[in-house]
């Protein structure tokens, strides 16, 4: 079943290559287990950036080597992606799945265009 997912259209990462945005979903029921996946679309190709499954009220747990971290509050997930460089500029799409209890719901946002600026090199010092 389809579910509405909202996310900001455009975000500029900070000078350290960190971008945060909220992914909000319109939950039709009382889900206890939610899966959030961040997808990156660039050059017409979609790749998975990171994913986490969490129990409502608990923290999101991404894999140890993931570039993503996040927190949840109600029907909102605050996602942070770090280690970004200019070449990582692209459309980052939030996918939310309500895993348990049934019925299963899934929603995909329109994507957040994340722009990343590589830091300017420091001038050489003598």
């Amino acid at each position: 079943k389809a579910m509405h997912v909202a996310q900001p259209a455009v975000v500029l990462a900070n000078s350290r290559g960190i971008a945060s945005f909220v992914c909000e979903y319109a939950s039709p029921g009382k889900a206890t287990e939610v899966r959030v996946t961040v997808l990156r679309q660039a050059d017409s190709q979609v790749t998975e950036v990171c994913a986490a499954t969490y129990m409502m009220g608990n923290e999101l747990t991404f894999l140890d080597d993931s570039i993503c971290t996040g927190t949840s509050s109600g029907n909102q997930v605050n996602l942070t992606i770090q280690g970004l460089r200019a070449m990582d500029t692209g459309l980052y799409i939030c996918k939310v799945e309500l895993m348990y209890p049934p019925p299963y719901y899934m929603g995909i946002g329109n994507g957040t265009q994340i722009y990343v600026i590589d830091p300017e090199p420091c001038p050489d010092s003598d």
Epitope: P8, A9, V10, V11, L12, A13, N14, A19, S20, F21, A42, D43, S44, A86, T89, L91, N110, G111, T112, Q113, Y115, I117
Partner: antibody
């Protein structure tokens, strides 16, 4: 409908500053960015920089760094662009434009800035 | 920074003509290329985004194509209201950069 309304024309002396406002309506202001673009008489479009309204991060064009400041007031859905130390070659029409995932889709009507002693 | 060039810088054409404007980027910008139309004394207007997608309300006589570094804007049958200046702009990387523009006037 979605629109950006800019402040009126300004006449400034060389060395002075100008602050142009851009009021957004009928969309979620924080979900998009605001770019500032200027156009000198008879010239093309020159991108000055943009502000990510969502988080306040800013990217200025190298040419304007140190002389321009872009800000937003989310309580009034208004963006501002201040340009300091005005020179005669800053005479131009200044536009704000909404930055989306797919280009700058909505533009303000433009603000004419005249620099004259 | 990514540099954008356009050709021709100006052209003269008649109502009903097919017009083609080209835009070239100094490095690959994938499909992140937008086209704007500007009439004298007016703000620019987004015509085409991501190379070939028509902005809402834009007539279907406008079309865009290309990828990588070379892009084209085509007006299949020029109408009186199409006499204007056209700019390409890349949104692949910041700083966003515009082409110098192509002025389309009446022959």
């Amino acid at each position: 409908q979605v629109q950006l309304v800019q402040s009126g024309a300004e006449v400034k002396k060389p060395g002075a500053s100008v602050k142009v406002s851009c009021k957004a309506s009928d969309y979620t202001f924080t979900s998009y960015g605001i770019s500032w673009v200027r156009q000198a008489p008879g010239q093309g479009l020159e991108w000055m920089g943009w502000i990510s309204v969502y988080n306040g991060n800013i990217n200025y064009a190298q040419k304007f760094k140190g002389r321009v400041t872009m800000t937003t007031d989310t309580s009034t859905s208004t963006a501002y662009m201040e340009l300091r130390s005005l020179r005669s070659d800053d005479m131009a029409v200044y536009y704000c434009a909404r930055v989306t995932q797919f280009g700058m889709d909505v533009w303000g009507q433009g603000t004419t800035v005249t620099v004259s002693s | 920074d990514i540099q954008m060039t356009q050709s021709p810088s100006s052209l003269s054409a008649s109502v009903g003509d097919r017009v083609t404007i080209t835009c070239r980027a100094s490095q690959s910008i994938s499909s992140n290329l937008n086209w704007y139309q500007q009439n004298p004394g007016k703000a620019p207007k987004l015509l085409i985004y991501t190379t070939s997608s028509l902005q809402g309300g834009v007539p279907s006589r406008f079309s865009g194509s290309g990828s990588g570094t070379d892009f084209t804007l085509t007006i299949s049958s020029l109408q009186p209201e199409d006499f204007a200046t056209y700019y390409c702009q890349q949104s692949f990387r910041t700083p966003f950069t515009f082409g110098p523009g192509t002025k389309v006037d009446i022959k």
